[in-house]
């Protein structure tokens, strides 16, 4: 979380912001919040970016103003304009891409003042992974795909039964580039599995940490899948 | 160059499937916002539905639960499945990559629904 | 679910005349969300203008979009034979994720 305050003669405002992570190929979320004033028309939200000229999105008098915005964000950016008067400034940015990923600055100015917060957003892939029974198999054999990571991740099986036990010898993982050469999918084989336990496959990165578990029985299979994002630090 | 070209339309009975095709060349579908929208005969643009790069997909509600979106990443090739399909399906369809906005659009395959 | 409604639906105009195209959406759409399509008869629609006042890559310079919030604008400053055609406006964003005009068609007085 980083929490800015503005500087100069006038009033400082409080603006919030929180560092987070965009999934390429998925629309993004840079949130920012801020002091809210009373008027609409007295509201300027500018977001800009580190190493960038023009402007990547400007909110002004209760509307969009992208005269100044710089090419790379054109039809991208917005901003949830019935929540501005909330003090919702956050930036919503289409089919986020690697190159989005830098230091972001949310400056406000109100009648009460001014304030930034600057935010770091990351950028990479991640995506729940599946565990199934691989029937294909000599032994009983446990297969955990996940569609897209990137940058590459650490693939950490854990069983319920065998809780700290180190299955790295039983296991193997391969990493497979997807067609637009930047994303991979993530393969991780499990071998010499056993009945009635509870098996993990725990794929992270420095983006996310995604689950999916696996309990098989006698008489059925239950799986289940979570998904984290990491860093997700206020300002 | 950058093209879309589509296929597979055609004369279907009511409740039968087809599955239309869209095929890309210059850039990669993968890594793009890629959309079917349609033109019924004398009428206006209907988005149908959009797939993400990562894979997320979309449906407007006159289709969903019929029509499924797809990509064949190997073959940079997107699908739409249709089902169930009715007469007011018949239309002309169109892919379109949306980057900035919907830049690139095929020629249209066109889809008539009838007994 | 966000509505646009262009007007007017017909617009009749002669070449060199200027002609004002309104799309309005039923509640707030982004500026950057907003773009504006040509369609000739058997063609495919061709983008025109994105972010609202952005011209796509080939589109000449009688064509300019503005507009904010609620009201967009596509204006043509000298008609060219060429340009009567019919004119749609498109979001993206909301539920349903994108949502077209229902048209102006721009025809020869």
């Known amino acids: 979380l980083i929490i800015g305050f503005g500087i100069s003669g006038r009033h400082s405002i409080t603006v919030t912001t929180v560092a987070s992570a965009g999934n390429i190929g998925e629309d993004g979320i840079l949130s920012c919040t801020f002091e809210p004033d009373i008027k609409l028309s007295d509201i300027v939200i500018q977001w800009l970016k580190e190493g960038v000229l023009g402007l990547v999105h400007e909110f002004k008098e209760g509307k969009d103003e992208l005269s100044e915005q710089d090419e790379m964000f054109r039809g991208r950016t917005a901003v949830f304009a019935d929540q501005v008067i909330v003090g919702n400034a956050s930036l919503r940015l289409k089919n986020v891409q690697l190159t989005d990923a830098g230091t972001y600055k949310c400056y406000i100015i109100t009648s009460k003042g001014k304030g930034n917060a600057n935010l770091e957003y990351k950028t990479g892939a991640f995506s729940m992974p599946e565990v199934n029974v691989d029937y294909n198999a000599s032994s009983e054999t446990l297969r955990c795909e996940a569609p897209r990571w990137f940058p590459q991740p650490t693939v950490v099986w854990a069983s319920q039964v065998d809780q700290g036990a180190n299955f790295s010898e039983v296991s193997n993982t391969s990493f497979e580039l997807n067609s637009e050469n930047v994303t991979m999918k993530v393969v991780s084989v499990l071998y010499n599995v056993t009945i009635n336990n509870t098996y993990s496959c725990m794929i992270e990165n420095d983006i996310a940490k995604a689950t999916g578990d696996i309990k098989v029985t006698e008489s059925e299979i239950k799986r289940r899948s979570h998904l984290q994002l990491l860093n997700s630090k206020a300002s | 160059e950058v093209q879309l070209v589509e296929s597979g339309g055609g004369l279907i009975q009511p409740g039968g499937s087809l599955r239309l095709s869209c095929a890309a060349s210059?850039?990669?579908?993968?890594?793009?916002?890629m959309n079917w929208v349609r033109q019924a005969p004398g009428k206006g643009l209907e988005w149908v539905s959009v797939?993400?790069?990562?894979?997320?997909?979309y449906y407007a509600d006159s289709v969903k639960g019929r029509v499924t979106i797809s990509r064949d990443n190997s073959k940079n090739t997107l699908y739409l499945q249709m089902n169930s399909l009715r007469a007011e399906d018949t239309a002309v369809y169109y892919c379109?990559?949306?980057?900035?906005?919907?830049?690139?659009w095929g020629q249209g395959t066109t889809v008539t629904v009838s007994s | 679910e966000i509505v646009l409604t262009q007007s007017p639906g017909t617009l009749s105009l002669s070449p060199g005349e200027r002609a004002t195209l309104s799309c309005r959406a039923s509640?707030?759409?982004?500026?950057?969300?907003l773009a504006w399509y040509q369609q000739k008869p058997g063609q495919a629609p061709r983008l025109l203008i994105y972010g609202a006042s952005s011209r796509a890559t080939g589109i000449p310079d009688r064509f300019s979009g503005s507009g904010s919030g609620t009201d967009f604008t596509l204006t043509i400053s000298r008609l060219e034979p060429e340009d009567f055609a019919v004119y749609y406006c498109q979001q993206y964003g909301s539920s349903p994720m994108y949502t077209f005009g229902q048209g102006t068609k721009l025809e020869i007085k």
């Open positions: 210059g850039f990669t579908v993968s890594s793009n916002y």
């Open positions: 797939i993400y790069g990562s894979g997320r997909t």
């Open positions: 379109a990559r949306d980057t900035y906005a919907m830049d690139v």
């Open positions: 509640q707030s759409v982004s500026s950057s969300y």
